[in-house]
């Protein structure tokens, strides 16, 4: 058993049929010595008396808010949560496996630049009685500070018969140099509590590996005389690290119709302009990627050909 | 004000072309190592990230773009103990810091070159003959060093009398290649920045 936060405790249980469970001793936070009784949640049934209560925690029915009283007055609370371990593996029932970039990916994180600011998100089908808390650091043995905000519900989607909820959090490394060469990864730890179930999820990454620039901005077309070719120009996104001659991007320019199966024109360039062939009912799209370290491509920025 | 993003002809700044070749060569070599040593811990997640130049050179600090010198987090330890001549310097007006930067890059390359050559000598003794260093990568390191053209004492190649542990050598190769790729990215950024300046 360990303390998650004040008056909230996590009991780690091996979860299998007829498991013996864990013996837990609760102590009432009071100077009083006698006349103390214990109850669980909203029940008025007295579970025991005295300053300490010893319980055998085996299942969720044994978890919850234990309260010690004296003469009708509440003295203190202890909330017990369960963390299940099945076949030596901690449970991951609360969050959905996003399976990208690999199986057992519960947290996904992205950074728009090298400033040390990043966003992580996760998915769940649970809509109520759910809380998250997020901690982060650079390295684990001698951790350096990363400050994370509160996790918030950022999107709701319908997937078949289920509703899916996306939560996200923004974090900022306390003293980040955009030009630094990372040797210690960022660690992100998410504590998830659903009713009386506790789970924790972690992710470890270098900022350079989670870079995904914003799409290029200000796409403009200029038809070329006596040709089917069009000159398309754009600018670096505002959120990208500066100076741009140091943090350079490379671009992919594509002309395509509505369907992915349609024919297309595609060209890669390090410049902020390119010449392509425009077709009726097609769109010109441009996306960006770090020129020197191949992490993710940005989303497409698009303009119609006509 | 941002510096221009269009890349002029590599001839304007001879080291730019070499640094691009360097990044390409080390990336290819790392990819080859990952594939060939697939049953060894050779991915970014599996290895310890070590920097053999730590406390010996300070390329990131010495080559910091002017725009980032206002960022206190970038100014931990600006070393200033480097040699100051070199043929990549575009004009006599080149700042003292630029000379420090280029000489720091040269020192990095020299250290990695020695490590890679020592390692290759060990790998050539491996009866499995599983992996060797790409000669192209070693040649590209040499070309960039020549383009930088700094006078510096030659570092003797380490020779080891004991029987090499090939498993450890291959893991060390992965660690070295990951670190060198990260440094090659920094070098490429620096050359691009200097070229635009």
């Amino acid at each position: 058993i360990w303390e998650l936060k004040k008056d909230v405790y996590v009991v780690e249980l091996d979860w299998y049929p007829d498991a013996p469970g864990e013996m837990v001793v609760l102590t009432c936070d009071t100077p009083e010595e006698d006349g103390i009784t214990w109850t669980l949640d909203q029940s008025s049934e007295v579970l025991g008396s005295g300053k300490t209560l010893t319980i055998q925690v085996k299942e969720f029915g044994d978890a919850g808010q234990y309260t010690c009283h004296k003469g009708g007055e509440v003295l203190s609370h202890s909330l017990l949560l369960l963390h299940k371990k099945e076949d030596g593996i901690w449970s991951t029932d609360i969050l959905k496996d996003q399976k990208e970039p690999k199986n057992k990916t519960f947290l996904r994180c992205e950074a728009k630049n090298y400033s040390g600011r990043f966003t992580c998100w996760w998915l769940t089908t649970i809509s109520t009685d759910l809380t998250f808390s997020v901690k982060s650091s650079r390295g684990s043995s001698d951790p350096q500070g990363v400050t994370c905000g509160a996790a918030t519900l950022s999107a709701e989607r319908v997937r078949g018969d289920n509703k899916e909820y996306e939560y996200s959090v923004e974090c900022q490394e306390d003293s980040a140099c955009p030009a630094a060469e990372e040797s210690l990864p960022i660690e992100v730890m998410v504590d998830a509590v659903h009713k009386l179930k506790y789970e924790n999820y972690t992710s470890s990454f270098f900022i350079r590996d989670i870079i995904k620039p914003d799409p290029p901005k200000n796409l403009q077309l200029k038809p070329l005389k006596n040709s089917r070719q069009v000159e398309v120009s754009w600018e670096y996104p505002d959120t990208w690290s500066t100076p741009h001659s140091y943090f350079s991007l490379t671009f992919c320019v594509q002309v395509q119709g509505k369907s992915k199966r349609e024919k297309k024109d595609r060209v890669f360039t390090d410049k902020t302009s390119a010449t392509v062939i425009c077709r009726k009912n097609a769109s010109i799209s441009v996306r960006a990627q770090d020129r020197y370290y191949s992490s993710s491509w940005s989303e497409w920025a698009s303009v119609p050909c006509s | 004000r941002n510096l221009p993003v269009a890349t002029p002809d590599p001839g304007m700044f001879p080291c730019l072309h070499h640094s691009q070749n360097l990044l390409r060569a080390v990336s290819n070599m790392l990819q080859k190592a990952r594939q060939t040593l697939e049953f060894y811990p050779c991915t970014s997640e599996e290895i310890d990230h070590e920097d053999i130049t730590k406390d010996k050179t300070s390329t990131v600090e010495a080559c910091l773009p002017l725009e980032l010198t206002k960022n206190e987090s970038c100014l931990n330890s600006r070393e200033t103990s480097f040699i100051t001549n070199g043929s990549c310097l575009a004009s006599r007006k080149t700042s003292f810091m630029m000379a420090l930067c280029l000489s720091s890059i040269y020192e990095d390359l020299k250290m990695y070159q020695v490590e890679f050559k020592t390692m290759n000598a060990k790998l050539l003794m491996d009866p499995k003959r599983q992996i060797f260093l790409d000669q192209n990568m070693l040649a590209v390191i040499d070309e960039l060093m020549q383009a930088l053209n700094f006078n510096s004492e030659t570092v003797p190649q380490k020779s080891s009398l004991e029987e090499p542990d090939f498993y450890k050598t291959k893991i060390k190769l992965c660690i070295l290649l990951h670190a060198f790729r990260i440094r090659a990215v920094t070098i490429d950024r620096v050359m691009s920045y200097l070229n635009a300046s």
Epitope: R228, Q229, T250, R261, E262, K263, K264, D265, R266, V267, F268, T269, D270, T275, I277, R279, K280 | T7, P10
Partner: antibody, heavy 118, light 107 residues
Framework: QVQLVQSGAEVKKPGSSVKVSCKAS????????LHWVRQAPGQGLEWMGW????????EYAPKFQGRVTITADESTSTAYMELSSLRSEDTAVYYC???????????WGQGTLVTVSS | DIVMTQSPLSLPVTPGEPASISCRAS??????LHWYQQKPGQAPRLLIY???QSISGVPSRFSGSGSGTDFTLTISSLQPEDFATYAC?????????FGQGTKVEIK
């Protein structure tokens, strides 16, 4: 299986024209760009131009501009390349090639040898 | 026009040995570079597109690398069927242009 089948070899006199055909099978004809590339004996490949069979748009290499005409007939899934004012240096194997991507070629015809000789 | 220069023009290789062919562009073409294999009396066959992207059905011993002006096609271990002419092609701008070809011959 996508295939491009070209017309047979031709022998032409200098100053005349030649029209080579390229019939496509497998896949929808208008879903692909179609190009013509030639190769003189013992020489490298030389791109001549392309056509979008969907709308008839064409683009030619400046070297052949005014001498080459590429057309397409959607009803027969056939593309044509006509080269006029032939000279002896036009002796080459002429290939049609296609792709959904405009700028490179993933399927090629078997080639048509055009010999220009007096 | 962008001029593509291949080297060497002829490459004698022992079967089972690796081979590397270089292609250089007269100006920077990013990764807009494609490789073809051509055997005598046959049409070219696409091997690699956009400098390093492999084509399904092409053996994994063929790989491409490079960007900007310098590109390489590598055959990790030459098989008897690999003795042919290899050509690079740029797609950075029209007109599309090819290298003159490199003939890989049995040593």
């Amino acid at each position: 299986q996508v295939q491009l089948v070209q017309s047979g070899a031709e022998v032409k006199k200098p100053g005349s024209s030649v029209k080579v055909s390229c019939k496509a099978s497998g896949g929808t004809f208008s879903d692909y760009y179609l190009h013509w590339v030639r190769q003189a004996p013992g020489q490298g490949l030389e791109w001549m131009g392309w056509i979008d069979p969907e709308n008839g748009d064409t683009e030619y290499a400046p070297k052949f501009q005014g001498r080459v005409t590429i057309t397409a007939d959607e009803s027969t899934s056939t593309a044509y390349m006509e080269l006029s004012s032939l000279r002896s240096e036009d002796t080459a194997v002429y290939y049609c090639a296609r792709n959904k991507e405009l700028r490179y070629f993933d399927v090629w015809g078997q080639g048509t040898l055009v010999t220009v000789s007096s | 026009d962008i001029v593509m220069t291949q080297s060497p023009l002829s490459l004698p290789v022992t079967p089972g040995e690796p081979a590397s062919i270089s292609c250089r562009a007269s100006q920077s073409i990013s990764i807009n570079l494609h490789w073809y294999q051509q055997k005598p009396g046959q049409a070219p066959r696409l091997l690699i597109y956009f400098a390093s992207q492999s084509i399904s059905g092409v053996p994994s011993r063929f790989s491409g690398s490079g960007s900007g002006t310098d590109f390489t096609l590598t055959i990790s271990s030459l098989q008897p069927e690999d003795f042919a002419t290899y050509a690079c092609q740029q797609s950075n701008s029209f007109p599309l242009t090819f290298g003159q070809g490199t003939k890989v011959e049995i040593k």
